[in-house]
Amino acid sequence: SAPFSFLSNVKYNFMRIIKYEFILNDALNQSIIRANDQYLTAAALHNLDEAVKFDMGAYKSSKDDAKITVILRISKTQLYVTAQDEDQPVLLKEMPEIPKTITGSETNLLFFWETHGTKNYFTSVAHPNLFIATKQDYWVCLAGGPPSITDFQILENQA
């Protein structure tokens, strides 16, 4: 069956970028890096200059959701993290500008951002039981939990 958000008419309006140029490290202290033009992966780095820097933009839901809804963009590019299905790699989608409004099938661009102490979780709005995750010898993907790693540390001001 279709994900619940595709069945609803919830509209998400862009508010503002709330973080620029941060790095995501998973629970094994691996940083997210570019695997190729389309995919991301995770690796233990000595030099964080190789890590992907992300910008995070906040969106407001028309249904006044208490969750923080965000879009993730690779800094200084027009590439946005896009969810696919469970165990499928997230894609990098090129768009000329950040979307003013997101609804329907485009919610695969959005994630619910939750924090628990220093742990950060990104749940797909299109697939609300799945998280952005790292997996050994695989691309960054959507996963429901172990053995994939779904919690991340945000490292800011690395410039």
Epitope: F14, R16, Y20, D55, E97, I98
Partner: nanobody
């Protein structure tokens, strides 16, 4: 009513310096992230630099990093941009503004005032 009045622009030779000022009124200046944006002749708006309300953190576009310095004096409700080692490609109208919602999406820019023209030419 929000008012931002930029000044300090002018004609300068390549390698020269200028200091821009922006006098703010009509809002609580010391609560806002402030920014400088610019528009080169025939081009779109470009974010240049931002500064947090206290002035503790500053941010710069790659094109001006190491040459420009943003600062503020909250007691005077004034924003500054010190521009050194100026280049021909810095020629633009410079506006001060509240930090745009997205530094890299021009539709989110919201600026006021007439701006101040900086021309870098020999």
């Amino acid at each position: 009513e929000v008012q931002l009045l930029e000044s300090g622009g002018g004609l300068v030779q390549p390698g020269g310096s200028l200091r821009l000022s922006c006098a703010a009124s009509g809002f609580t200046f010391d609560r806002y992230i402030m920014a400088w944006v610019r528009q080169a002749p025939g081009k779109g708006l470009e974010w240049v630099s931002s500064i947090t309300p206290s002035g503790a953190a500053t941010y710069y576009a790659d094109s001006v990093k190491g040459r420009f310095t943003i600062s503020r004096d909250n007691s005077k409700n004034t924003l500054y941009l010190q521009m050194n080692s100026l280049r021909a490609e810095d020629t633009a109208v410079y506006y001060c503004a509240e930090e745009p919602a997205d530094r890299y999406s021009t539709w989110t820019f919201d600026y006021w005032g007439q701006g101040t023209l900086v021309t870098v030419s020999s």
